[in-house]
Interface confidence: low
């Protein structure tokens, strides 16, 4: 899969929606210049392609939604990489430009005669892509042509800025919300000194920025902050891990505003460096409850606490997806490649026959084996439905009493569609209300997950809490079998009575040494000792001073008893 030839999935229709999914992994560092993508992806790729195709079938067969109008699509591969996604978006735009020129009769043949050739229908909107950095680049292009974009997992806070990203909307909340949720978890367990890691790129950078800002306001100190690319080499991850160990045993908690593959890189480095069990990873929704992050490295991931966007599995998608077979599924051009990759076998007689697999695929193979639904499936489907409802509302207002596309909707005006989309609200696939605020964002609801060893060599994610619009609920007993097991991540222990904190030059406010006040001093505040005035003495609890009662000697009082040093 290189830059020369890109595969596209098509589905015909009266209105065409574009989609960008990461069908393949991003190019490795050495392949970036060629834009040569990595291996095929199931959850983030193939499942999302199939979700788009099948959801459109459901919409088209629903008599109440866009009656007499068929929705089609054009799905392209973003490879979770800006350059590839931009290249693909230009293809969307090119189709739109040619189509609009046709509408205006501007397309003529070389000999001057008019053309009877009809090019592809324009793309009215785009679903995706998944990554925030990639979504920003794509939006920069799409908004020039008034093409609305609805994202299903791009959560960067920057995308809320409508002056910069006018045509961008999303069915997920902004990362400001999960940064808050992460800080609330850190606060809950009294972790005041944590290390921080984020994925280079917009998602990680803006998310970590928010986490650090909120942490500072809550008196939480960051031991050190590091950044790394998901596709960085082993040496880079090893180097990062070694830096993190330099903050042990104080900063045991590592807050990771990271893409899933960054977390995997960290886990792999922990294995190489034998650091399993030394850290507790607190991960953002890039990790969530993904098995492709932890597979093979479960021991290193144990104890991890992660944030997951609330999105239950979609049963009807599984009913459809699990029946798919390579010999009958021809509309998904990546399916045969995926099948071979998934089962590590060769599909004989298919053009994408891959010689790297020696074994021929058995006809009894089924997707039911080890099936895991994409954790963001509900959002992908909601994004597609949002586009359909937006178009439906637009049709109702522009073509009253008319079933189908009236002239007022030809061609579809992106500005009017955006207006209609922003007003859209409907019941989502999981029964929750889908609506958009003035920034095109959706409300924040998260599940808190914990990766645990459930039995010998059996590991899994369990739901241990939720964060809903500012309220954190956690089942502490599920995370920690007993209170004494709660990991400590503090730089300095509290000072004892009569001691003050002395913060060393250049140290953060969470790291101090405890120094006792002098004999005639009391603790004025946690950083200052003050001498009692003449004639007074510190109280027993050293919080203030008491006057020393004056005693006058009278005749007849016994003499004071002076002892020699030699007296025992």
């Amino acid at each position: 899969q290189s830059s020369e030839r890109r595969v596209v999935a098509h589905m015909p229709g009266d209105i065409i929606i574009g989609a960008l999914f990461s069908v393949h992994h991003q190019p490795t560092v050495d392949k970036v210049h060629e834009r040569k993508c990595g291996a095929v992806r199931e959850q983030y790729g193939i499942q999302r392609v199939e979700a788009m195709l099948h959801t459109l079938e459901r919409i088209n067969s629903d008599p109440t939604l866009l009656p007499n109008i068929t929705l089609g699509c054009e799905i392209r591969d973003s490879c979770w990489h800006s350059a590839v996604a931009l290249e693909q978006s230009i293809e969307f735009i090119r189709d739109s430009l040619i189509s609009s020129e046709e509408e205006e009769g501007l397309v003529r043949c070389v000999d001057g005669s008019s053309s009877s050739f009809r090019s592809k229908k324009p793309i009215v909107g785009v679903i995706g892509p998944g990554s925030s950095s990639v979504a920003i680049q794509v939006q920069n292009l799409l908004q020039l042509f008034n093409i609305p974009q609805i994202a299903y997992s791009a959560t960067s806070m920057d995308l809320s800025d409508k002056t910069l990203f006018k045509y961008f909307m999303r069915v997920v909340p902004s990362d400001a919300q999960q940064a808050r949720a992460m800080v609330d978890i850190v606060k809950r367990y009294n972790w005041t000194y944590v290390s921080a890691v984020h994925t280079e790129g917009n998602y990680g950078e803006s998310g970590m920025e928010a986490f650090k800002d909120m942490s500072a306001k809550e008196g939480i100190c960051i031991a050190h902050s590091y950044k790394i690319y998901s596709n960085a080499g082993e040496q880079s991850f090893d180097k990062l891990l070694k830096k993190l160990t330099s903050h042990l045993p104080k900063a045991r908690v590592v807050a990771c505003f990271c893409e899933g593959m960054t977390v995997r890189g960290l886990l792999m480095a922990m294995r190489r460096l034998g650091l399993a069990g030394e850290f507790l990873l607190l991960g953002s929704d890039g990790w969530a409850d993904r098995y492709d992050v932890t597979d093979g490295y479960q021991r290193e991931a144990v104890g991890g606490i992660t944030i997951k966007l609330q999105s239950p599995d979609v049963k009807w998608f599984d009913d459809y997806y699990l029946k798919l077979r390579p010999e009958t599924n021809h509309r998904n051009p990546w399916f045969q490649e995926f099948w071979q990759h998934r089962f590590q076998c060769r599909l004989e007689g298919f053009p994408q026959e891959n010689s790297k697999y020696n074994k021929t695929c058995d006809s009894s193979l089924t997707l039911k084996t080890h099936h895991v639904q994409d954790s963001k499936m509900g959002f992908v489907i909601n994004a597609i439905y949002s586009m359909a409802y937006g178009l439906h509302n637009m049709q109702m207002s522009l073509c009253p009493g008319y079933a189908g596309l009236c002239d007022a909707m030809k061609p579809i005006d992106g500005r009017k569609l955006l207006e209609s989309l922003m007003k859209t609200n409907f019941t989502g696939v999981s029964g929750d209300m889908i609506l958009f605020d003035e920034n095109g964002d959706s409300p924040g609801r998260y599940e808190i997950m914990n990766f645990k060893e459930m039995g010998k060599d059996y590991f899994d994610y369990i739901n241990v809490g939720s964060w809903d619009n500012g309220e954190l609920k956690m089942d502490d007993d599920e995370v920690w079998s007993k209170k004494s097991n709660i990991i400590r991540s503090v730089c300095s222990e509290p000072c004892e009575k009569g001691q003050i904190k002395v913060i060393r030059k250049g140290e953060v406010s969470c790291c101090w040494t405890c120094t006792p006040c002098k004999e005639n001093e009391y603790v004025f505040d946690e950083y200052t000792c003050k001498a009692c005035q003449l004639g007074s003495w510190p109280t027993d609890d050293l919080t203030g001073c008491d006057l020393i009662p004056v005693q006058y000697l009278r005749w007849g009082d016994p003499e004071p008893d002076y002892k020699d040093d030699d007296d025992k």
Partner: antibody, heavy 120, light 109 residues
Framework: QQQLEESGGGLVKPGGTLTLTCKAS?????????MCWVRQAPGKGLEWIAC???????TYYASWAKGRFTISKTSSTTVTLQMTSLTAADTATYFC?????????????WGQGTLVTVSS | DIVMTQTPASVEAAVGGTVTIKCQAS??????LAWYQQKPGQPPKLLIY???NLESGVPSRFKGSGSGTEFTLTISDLECADAATYYC???????????FGGGTEVVVK
């Protein structure tokens, strides 16, 4: 039953070269392990030499072994240890061992060892 | 490289008794320590990994503890079959290298 079997040991002259092979049976390296070599001089303690990660072929060496010893995964069931510039101090029983980490989880499967004698 | 110092070199105890073997690392190795039992003519057998985790099939009479630089292996209710040489193995993550202790010979009377 999972087993490791070392071969290739024997008598070699000082300055010579020898390649030891560790063959796994009942184990498929696609499960990703660390395959390591440990040696034990007669009547002495254990000495770690090197490990190879079967997932990507990454190698890890004791500082004294770098340059003279080369560990590699040669197939889905074999690992080799190539030893050059051998001296009498290299006389030992060489064990092949398997672990889940380079060292952090210990080695839970060992071969019976192969004896290497360096002598003129 | 990391250096592992094991004490004592030899220890004698009666059946039913308890033996304690200590292992000290020259640098902090966190919990990265394993204990092995080796009998003459046999390869080592893993007893404990990550300082305190009992390998499956190993009796609970074997107990590992410690972290950082100081580690201990305690064998209680000694049996004749426990007579062997015991080795600690430390793993230093910063240099990705291992080192074994010199070994402790346990004699059971």
């Amino acid at each position: 039953q999972q087993q490791l079997e070392e071969s290739g040991g024997g008598l070699v002259k000082p300055g010579g070269t020898l390649t030891l092979t560790c063959k796994a049976s009942g184990i498929d390296f696609s499960g990703y392990y660390y395959m390591c070599w440990v040696r034990q001089a007669p009547g002495k303690g254990l000495e770690w030499i090197a490990c190879v990660y079967t997932g990507d072929g990454g190698t890890y060496y004791a500082s004294w072994a770098k340059g003279r010893f080369t560990i590699s995964k040669t197939s889905s069931t074999t690992v080799t240890l190539q030893m050059t510039s051998l001296t009498a101090a290299d006389t030992a029983t060489y064990f092949c061992a398997r672990g889940s980490g380079v060292g952090s989880y210990g080695y839970n499967l060992w071969g019976q060892g192969t004896l290497v004698t360096v002598s003129s | 490289d990391i250096v592992m110092t094991q004490t004592p070199a030899s220890v004698e105890a009666a059946v039913g008794g308890t033996v304690t073997i200590k292992c000290q690392a020259s640098e902090s190795i966190y919990s990265n320590l394993a204990w092995y039992q080796q009998k003459p003519g046999q390869p080592p057998k893993l007893l404990i990994y990550r300082a305190s985790n009992l390998e499956s099939g190993v009796p609970s009479r074997f107990k590992g503890s410690g972290s950082g630089t100081e580690f201990t292996l305690t064998i209680s209710d000694l049996e004749c079959a426990d007579a062997a040489t015991y080795y600690c193995q430390g793993y230093y993550a910063i240099t990705t290298t291992n080192a074994f202790g010199g070994g402790t010979e346990v004699v059971v009377k």
